[in-house]
Interface confidence: low
């Protein structure tokens, strides 16, 4: 899987969308998990409703919500009050039995609030994932980059 980058601003909400084939994944619950290492486990953050027919209902775990449009084939994750420590590598998953298929690999980046006059260094953003070799960037303003284009050109 390629990795899609979503950028959000600290303190604001970020919506991550994971499109999928609604027929192929019919009847399957979905989940959002956090990848901790190159080969490490993906740790579950939140999953859709236990009853697949109620997947459209938003479920929360802390500041993270998940909802699934099973007809349209779009899983949506909302990270509310985005914080620096929310940044990292995640996966959208489709669950079947004890197995999980990866729908999308997502890299969440947290940007400093331009209206926040604290030193940007007060927010800490560390490093990237081993599996981030073929990356596409999807800003919160929905700008996608072409493969090979440098994801985040310097602004200064």
């Amino acid at each position: 899987h390629n990795t899609t980058v979503f950028q959000g601003v600290a303190g604001q909400s970020l919506q991550v969308s994971c499109p999928y084939d609604s027929m192929k994944h019919w009847g399957r619950r979905k989940a959002w998990c956090r990848q901790l290492g190159e080969k490490g486990p993906c740790q579950r953050v939140v999953s859709t409703h236990n009853l697949w027919l109620l997947s459209f209902l938003r479920r929360w775990n802390g500041s993270t919500a998940i909802t699934d449009d099973t007809l349209g084939g779009t899983l949506t994750i909302t990270l509310r009050n985005l914080q620096p420590h929310d940044a990292g590598l995640y996966q959208c998953q489709s669950l079947h039995g004890s197995e999980a298929d990866t729908l999308r690999k997502v890299l969440v980046e947290v940007l400093a609030d331009p209206l926040d006059h604290r030193d940007a260094g007060d927010l800490w953003f560390p490093g990237e994932s081993e599996s981030f070799e073929d990356a596409h960037v999807e800003h919160s303003i929905s700008r996608s980059l072409l493969e090979g284009e440098i994801p985040f050109p310097p602004t200064s």
Epitope: A112, W124, G127, E128, F132, E133, I150, P151, F152
Partner: antibody, heavy 122, light 109 residues
């Protein structure tokens, strides 16, 4: 094989400037946050600065803010550290390091260069 | 800053178990993950990643090394200790701006 090769160290007088470089080989440099970590003689490790994939976000420890500037050239797969107004307490071996995973709360430093010695003395 | 405290030195016999501790002044847990990592530095060499997120063994590191702990108390265990394990071991937190412990020098008795 991932390799990080630092250069540019040496002896410099207090108040003067020096620029360190780090050539990155064996991985897609533009996909990774990078950082500098230093180690004073016979002392422990100290994170100095980090930079995001495109260079648009930079982070510094308080003691070097306003004096050090971390930058990168993705086309050349090279990381830099411009060090101005150098002080004796900046004397250390400077390591170029790659960070695993983006984000804020640092992930860990999975590859380290051999290090380059910077000596600030009159 | 989060402060990490390590005991400066530890002496163990070859083939025995070495346990190195690292204590933090703040919780480094987030969402059930412990943002604590361990490095080994042998004399004259650059540090090498051993353990990430408290208990995950880094690539190429022998299973003699293991990590555990949560919240504010963490340990790195080497069992059994071999001759080339003589080194300084550093913990590092990444729950906030990265900071390292002062290091624990492991020596053979």
């Amino acid at each position: 094989e991932v390799q990080l090769v630092e250069s540019g160290g040496g002896l410099v007088q207090p108040g003067r400037s020096m620029k360190l470089s780090c050539a990155a080989l064996g991985f897609t440099f533009s996909n990774y946050y990078m950082a500098w970590v230093r180690q004073a003689p016979r002392k422990g490790l100290e994170w100095v600065a980090s930079i995001s994939t495109g260079g648009d976000n930079t982070y510094y420890r308080d003691s070097v803010k306003g004096r050090f500037t971390i930058s990168r050239d993705n086309a050349k797969s090279t990381l830099y550290m411009q060090m101005d107004s150098l002080r004796s307490e900046d004397t250390a071996t400077y390591y170029c390091v790659r960070s695993f995973i983006v984000g804020t709360t640092g992930y860990y430093f999975d590859y380290w260069g051999q290090g380059v010695m910077v000596t600030v003395s009159s | 800053d989060i402060v990490l405290t390590q005991s400066p030195a530890l002496a163990v016999s070859l083939g025995q178990r070495a346990t190195i501790s690292c204590k933090t002044n703040q919780n480094v847990d987030y969402y059930g993950n412990n943002y604590m990592h361990w490095y080994q530095q042998t004399p004259g060499q650059q540090p090498k990643l051993l353990i990430y997120f408290a208990s995950n063994l880094a690539s190429g590191i022998p299973a003699r090394f293991s990590g555990r702990g949560s919240g504010t108390d963490f340990t790195l265990t080497i069992d059994p200790v071999e001759a080339d394990d003589t080194a300084t071991y550093y913990c590092q937190q990444s729950r906030n701006l990265p900071t390292f412990g002062g290091g624990t020098k492991l020596e053979l008795k």
